[in-house]
């Protein structure tokens, strides 16, 4: 057993051109916090693979404002390290993945929102035990900087921490092949580490996982004694009638503890030691709330106000998982129509079309529009054998090669008013309308007072001019 | 011509969670502003929440915290996540659409919740 650790230096805009934008405005201040999961191992394994190493969350880092004008400096992070604890051996070799996190704090419906600033991974040799290791990785314009170490947990040691040290049972000396554990040479080295919760004194081991008990103890863990008076048969009698103890069923036997927790024996009964996350009897309980985050790739965190009501993460389109951790192959839903090949991006599905053949998903038929291209993401629209380019805001022309006055296009819908702006436009929506665009009748024209019948479908309104 | 189905209603216990669901037929829904609107007995209809072409979102004050507006464009849905329901959330919720290219607005057929004990 033993803890990996994860320093975070800095991140921040890496060096040549094309700084990135900083993630946080004036409006929309935010701060950052981490990711990392660990894999065994050196394959290239998937991104959404169980962490099967362990996987920890930082800290939020400090409120973050960006100064207008200034160029995106390195980000305050989180205080402290990201521990990672593994129960078994350390693997040598290792993968990780480190991802950089934005929580978002300007007015959010339902809470802070989240999203995937960075993601870097990365395949490592590491031996426990030694030195911090330090390294630097590149995500499109932002670098990483952070170093990282793999320890073992007392009273394990060595390069996989899977020996164990043991207090001398002599006082000069170790027993045969072992040598003492540096730095404390008043113990020394035990080969193997037996199974978790062995008696240090009534048991030992061959193999690793095992627990063979000297003479005079029994149980699974080498913690019951045994009587010296001869027993009758080879399970032994009753302890009623010879005092001799037959070995029953251990209380760790089937191990009660869930979720990972080790199980210890106790005079009266058991004792379950819990991983970080987990508490109760018997680690049943989970101890993560909707405040540590628990949803991962932009999932919506419900419940889980606290540690004894459970959370559940819903997540985005494209994700899922209990921890929306899990990136679904929405290719396999075969979105594409009319033969258009299907491109995962991760933040976006994309349809390669055929010659054509136009629209998100490849469902317009656009004959008059094959070998024909509309610029700056205009769309082709088929129309009676000529081809024209529905263009995109801010371009016009034939070809929507002609950068247009974003206005032009009356974007305000229902008589908002449009105002040029150097992101883009504004719409100041007449009284009674919402959204961007000034799209939402807050009260519809004809939704008079009940009993009124469901409008049903309406191809049209009143303010189709606008 | 946008044809728009809705699911998802029912009744449900006051603290209670729904999900309402929009299908869009023909028309992408990435390029429509979608939104869910609400009628209750003896009251105008109103607007719920919407999410326009670029993602950004609106609701009323009353549900705000609560409720969720999202679309998927690969399933040409459009959804509305209701979480802590209340008794005046009783109403028959309505699927709108507002298209850019035919600047029409579109309706769909309702579907009924009923938050009661």
């Known amino acids: 057993a033993g803890v990996f650790e994860l320093q975070i230096h800095s991140f921040g805009p890496g060096p040549g051109p094309g700084a990135p934008r900083s993630p946080c405005s004036a409006r929309l201040p935010c701060r950052l916090f981490f990711r990392v999961c660990l894999k065994p191992g050196l394959s290239e394994e998937a991104a959404e693979s169980p962490c099967a190493l362990g996987a920890a969350l930082s800290a939020r880092g400090p409120v973050y404002t960006e100064q207008p004008g200034a160029p995106a400096p390195d980000l305050p992070l989180p205080d402290g390290l990201l521990q990672v604890p593994f129960r078994d051996a350390w693997p040598g070799t290792f993968s990780f993945i480190i991802e950089t996190w934005r929580e978002e704090l300007g007015d959010q419906i339902g809470g802070p929102a989240w999203s995937l600033l960075a993601r870097v991974a990365g395949r490592r040799r590491l031996a426990a035990g030694g030195p911090w290791a330090r390294d630097i990785q590149r995500a499109g314009a932002w670098e990483l900087r952070f170093s990282y170490r793999a320890r073992c947990e007392p009273p394990a040691v060595g390069t996989a921490c899977t020996r164990l040290c043991r207090p001398r049972s002599a006082p000069s000396r170790c027993g045969p092949g072992l040598r003492p554990c540096a730095p404390l040479e008043d113990e020394c080295e035990a080969p193997l580490v037996c199974r978790a919760g062995c008696s240090p004194e009534h048991g030992f081991c061959e193999q690793p996982g095992e627990c063979r008990c000297l003479e005079g103890w029994t149980g699974p863990l080498c913690t019951v004694p045994v009587s010296t008076s001869s027993c009758l048969s080879p399970r032994g009698p009753s302890s009623a009638t010879t005092g001799c103890l037959v070995p029953g069923p251990g209380p760790c036997d089937g191990n009660p503890c869930a979720n990972g927790g080790s199980c210890s024996e106790t005079p009266r009964s058991f004792e379950c030691t819990c991983p970080r996350g987990f508490y109760g009897l018997r680690c049943e309980v989970s101890g993560v709330t909707c405040a540590d985050g628990p949803c991962f790739n932009g999932g919506l965190c419900v419940g889980g106000a606290d540690p004894d009501s459970a959370y559940i993460c819903h997540c985005p389109p494209g994700f899922q998982g209990s921890n929306c951790e899990k990136r679904v192959d929405r290719c396999s839903l075969q979105p594409c129509r009319n033969g258009g090949l299907c491109l995962d991006l991760g933040h976006a599905l994309r349809c390669r079309c055929r010659a054509g053949f136009a629209g998100p998903r490849c469902e317009h038929d656009l004959d008059d529009c094959a070998g024909r291209a509309c610029a700056n993401g205009g769309t082709c629209v088929e129309g009676g054998g000529a081809h024209r380019c529905s263009c995109a805001l801010g371009f016009g022309g034939r070809d929507c090669r002609e950068r247009a006055d974003p206005c032009a296009a009356r974007p305000c819908a229902h008589g908002g008013r449009c105002y040029a702006h150097f992101s883009g436009l504004v719409c100041a929506c007449a009284p009674g309308y919402m959204g961007a665009r000034c799209e939402f009748p807050v009260h519809p024209d004809g939704a008079s007072a009940l009993p009124a019948a469901p409008p049903g479908l309406r191809p049209g309104d009143p303010q189709r001019y606008l | 011509e946008v044809q728009l189905v809705e699911s998802g209603g029912g009744l449900v216990q006051p603290g209670g969670s729904l999900t309402l669901s929009c299908a869009a037929s023909?028309?992408?829904?990435?390029?429509?502003?979608s939104a869910w609107y609400r009628q209750a007995p003896g009251k105008k209809r109103e607007l719920v929440a919407g999410?326009?072409?670029?993602?950004?979102?609106v609701y009323i004050d009353s549900v705000k915290g609560r409720f969720t507006i999202s679309r998927d464009n690969a399933k040409n849905s459009v959804y509305l996540q209701m979480n802590s329901l209340r008794a005046e959330d009783t109403a028959v919720y309505y699927c709108?659409?507002?298209?850019?290219?035919?600047?029409?607005?579109?309706w769909g057929q309702g579907t009924l919740v009923t938050v009661s004990s």
């Open positions: 709108y659409a507002y298209s850019w290219t035919t600047r029409s607005r579109y």
């Open positions: 023909e028309s992408s829904v990435s390029f429509l502003s």
């Open positions: 999410i326009s072409t670029d993602g950004s979102t």
